[in-house]
Amino acid sequence: DSEEDEEHTIITDTELPPLKLMHSFCAFKADDGPCKAIMKRFFFNIFTRQCEEFIYGGCEGNQNRFESLEECKKMCTRDNANRIIKTTLQQEKPDFCFLEEDPGICRGYITRYFYNNQTKQCERFKYGGCLGNMNNFETLEECKNICEDGPNGFQVDNYGTQLNAVNNSLTPQSTKVPSLFEFHGPSWCLTPADRGLCRANENRFYYNSVIGKCRPFKYSGCGGNENNFTSKQECLRACKKGFIQRISKGGLIKTKRKRKKQRVKIAYEEIFVKNM
């Protein structure tokens, strides 16, 4: 039985506003469906924790779709939730910070950043534009925030003032909406599966960030996006370790893990699905 890791979690009444999902479908990605109508609808976005507008094609899709903002709020948020799951702050970097830089297999070479565990600093590297691993950041600041040690030995958070690498000036970072889970892998792991524009039916895998798993889909053979892998293993390697838990002050949390597949699902659903 291939094992995965279990989160050691603490149930608390604490500072972070909880992710108040009353129904599992509130965690689904917005799905416009295959049809071509242009209909204004609303869905609940688990990353911003808000109901947002999207364009629905008129058929299929999923249950995370509402006629009005009010209906969306009514179905997917609650004000009286009083518990969240969080993990204790570790003075450890995410595992992927220790990976060697990996250019991937493509040839659209661009400058990216990785954390060099030997020099203990973020450095630029030549990235091919696809695959590779999670130790891959678009900006120096992002790399430093996640992988470099702050002055007190903790990871630098995204809420404070950061050193601007280009001119060494201190610049306030834009405050992100705090969320219980943030994704720090390649941004394409958060994009929906995209068949593309051609007519082939190739078996591919994409990372479903809502359920945290790699799932098969049919690729048309051209276009699409980078959330597209020829094997499940490739998909997992690129995207699986991207979720980092956060506490309210923005400090990164590395979750301690134990091996057991079923338990992960339960811990995950407790956060995203359970009636609270």
């Epitope: 070479y109 661009i110 400058t111 950043y113 060099n116 030997q118 020099t119 600093q121 973020c122 450095e123 630029r124 590297f125 030549k126 900006t139 120096l140 690498a165 280009v166 001119n167």
Partner: antibody, heavy 119, light 108 residues
Framework: EVQLVQSGAELKKPGASVKLSCKAS????????MHWVRQAPGQGLEWIGE????????NYNEKFKTRATLTADKSTSTAYMELSSLRSEDTAVYYC????????????WGQGTTVTVSS | EIVLTQSPATLSLSPGERATLSCSAS???????LYWYQQKPGQAPRLWIS???ILASGVPARFSGSGSGTKYTLTISSLEPEDFAVYFC?????????FGQGTKLEIK
């Protein structure tokens, strides 16, 4: 004081190879990238490639990948660039320049080596 | 590769005048990755501006840089005799790193 001192001028025949050196001093050689850039007479600058001496990481401009070889000798803090199968269009001043690991601000440059390819 | 096209190729101006040098990229380049170098005859290039607008050490304040996407500009508000040189724009967002062909700023 940071210094990059390059080897002397070279006159080569078409088809030959040339190996240029760039001796670094005044900084930790292995902690920076070393770039090679060339400039043909009256022309612009052309990036050939870069090497990070600590682990020998090298990135080439595809245009030069089959003919250029970048190496570094950590013991002498010297970077080398060898260019093979020389042709007349390779006549140029070849510069080495260093940059940090976080950007490509080439803040110190060698004085340049003139390579002339002529039969 | 990203092609950087500088214009004009030659700019003839007098001391005290304002100079505007342009650099156009064939694809979008993040402003953090767009640099400028100055080169005088018989010398190696010198880093002049980094990250589109940050003046390198020792560069006078009459120099400024701006732009985003595919259009970048180096401006000299009032030319001094020592400013006459060749200026190259440079991008390191995409490999291979590339330079513009240069703008020669000459005395009229």
């Amino acid at each position: 004081e940071v210094q990059l001192v390059q080897s002397g001028a070279e006159l080569k025949k078409p088809g030959a190879s040339v190996k240029l050196s760039c001796k670094a001093s005044g900084y930790t050689f292995t902690s920076y990238w070393m770039h090679w850039v060339r400039q043909a007479p009256g022309q612009g600058l052309e990036w050939i490639g870069e090497i990070k001496p600590d682990k020998g990481r090298i990135n080439y401009n595809e245009k030069f990948k089959t003919r250029a070889t970048l190496t570094a000798d950590k013991s002498t803090s010297t970077a080398y660039m060898e260019l093979s199968s020389l042709r007349s269009e390779d006549t140029a001043v070849y510069y080495c320049a260093r940059s940090s690991v976080i950007d490509v601000a080439m803040d110190y440059w060698g004085q340049g080596t003139t390579v002339t390819v002529s039969s | 590769e990203i092609v950087l096209t500088q214009s004009p190729a030659t700019l003839s101006l007098s001391p005290g005048e304002r100079a505007t040098l342009s650099c156009s990229a064939s694809s979008s380049v993040s402003s953090s990755y767009l640099y400028w170098y100055q080169q005088k005859p018989g010398q190696a290039p010198r880093l002049w501006i980094s990250g589109t607008s940050i003046l390198a050490s020792g560069v006078p304040a009459r120099f400024s840089g701006s732009g985003s996407g595919t259009k970048y500009t180096l401006t000299i508000s009032s030319l001094e005799p020592e400013d006459f040189a060749v200026y190259f724009c440079h991008q390191w967002s995409h490999y291979p790193f590339t330079f513009g062909q240069g703008t020669k700023l000459e005395i009229k």
